[in-house]
Interface confidence: medium
């Protein structure tokens, strides 16, 4: 069963998460980002179920192409540092999953923008803090 | 209006670990839309980035510090840190402490007042 | 990796103009935004351009900043010298990787 202080450390990964997965979308979504027409153009896939901490698994497999888009976005207006984020997000989702079981990700048949996909997984995440509090 | 406050030892001896405190006021770490930075300055030199950390804890380094360069963040005291370890008399200097945005671009603004820091024996 | 090359030092009378130029050794100036930190002796630095050409509030219109692609170099203008713009002043940009500042220029108001 897992204690409270075990609870407690998955809750904050979980807001961390949370937290970057936000900054990235709010980056996306500035009024300023002159790439953001071309952004949509590029397909992610989606979780067909996302309720449990294994789930991340279907994250973690499009964490890649997220990277190749931020790079492609780049520009004056649009800053981020992809390389270090997603490697940050990738620990995370590592540590949250577990490596001990090997999850295969069953993914939706219609694809997302990267806006769709990051909504999804920033509502996955206040979902399961929303069941730990 | 935002200020930050650099704290800490001004004497670390050679190999050991420099650890230096800023503390926000006037504004909140937590509030979003912001990094926030650790920049040094020689003395009589320029200055040099040396990284950044956001809200969440995600931490980004200067690539010729990031071996040795450790940054965290406390929210629920206003405040971010900077651990910089094995330190030589080379990294004797004004720690400067300072907010940067998250993604219209890096620079930083406003700054801290600055903590000399000397490494000796 | 690029370098940012300011003028050590540029000197002018109270009233006129001066110019300091920051030119990076490679990739384009244009790509990411440039920004100018004043310095006076004993004090930290405040922003007076950011974002190439945006002056921060409270900083008078006697600063400004521009882009020369041409050149491959960033400017900043300081118009109607006064005494008090006496100072150090840093150039700065960055890329996906690091974050750069030039050398800094000694500005003497004679």
């Known amino acids: 069963a897992p204690t409270s202080s075990s609870t407690k450390k998955t809750q904050l990964q979980l807001e961390h998460l949370l937290l970057d997965l936000q900054m990235i979308l709010n980056g996306i979504n500035n009024y300023k980002n002159p790439k953001l027409t071309r952004m949509l153009t590029f397909k992610f896939y989606m979780p067909k179920k996302a309720t449990e901490l294994k789930h991340l698994q279907c994250l973690e497999e499009e964490l890649k192409p997220l990277e190749e888009v931020l790079n492609l976005a780049q520009s004056k207006n649009f800053h981020l540092r992809p390389r270090d984020l997603i490697s940050n997000i990738n620990v995370i989702v590592l540590e949250l999953k577990g490596s001990e079981t090997t999850f295969m990700c069953e993914y939706a048949d219609e694809t997302a923008t990267i806006v769709e996909f990051l909504n999804r997984w920033i509502t996955f995440c206040q979902s399961i803090i929303s069941t730990l509090t | 209006q935002l200020q930050l406050q650099e704290s800490g030892p001004g004497l670390v001896k050679p190999s050991q670990t420099l650890s230096l405190t800023c503390t926000v006021s006037g504004g909140s770490i937590s509030s979003g839309g912001y990094y926030w930075s650790w920049i040094r300055q020689h003395p009589g030199k320029g200055l040099e980035w040396i990284g950044y950390?956001?809200?969440?804890?995600?931490?980004y380094y200067s690539p010729s510090l990031k071996s040795r360069v450790t940054i965290s963040v406390d929210t629920s005291k206003n405040q971010f840190s900077l651990k910089l370890s094995s330190v030589t008399a080379a990294d004797t200097a004004v720690y400067y402490c300072a907010r940067t945005p998250t993604v219209t671009g890096d620079w930083f603004d406003p700054w801290g007042r600055g903590t000399l820091v000397t490494v000796s024996s | 990796n690029f370098m940012l090359t300011q003028p050590h030092s540029v000197s002018e009378s109270p009233g006129k103009t001066v110019t300091i130029s920051c030119t990076r050794s490679s990739g384009s100036i244009a790509s990411n935004y440039v920004q100018w930190y004043q310095q006076r002796p004993g004090s930290s630095p405040t922003t007076v351009i950011y974002e190439d050409n945006q002056r921060p509030s409270g900083v008078p219109d006697r600063f400004s900043g521009s882009i020369d692609s041409s050149s491959n170099s960033a400017s900043l203008t300081i118009s109607g010298l006064k005494t008090e713009d006496e100072a150090d002043y840093y150039c700065?940009?960055?890329?996906?990787?690091?974050?750069?500042f030039g050398g800094g220029t000694k500005l003497t108001v004679l």
């Open positions: 950390i956001y809200k969440s804890g995600s931490a």
């Open positions: 700065q940009t960055y890329d996906s990787i690091d974050v750069y």
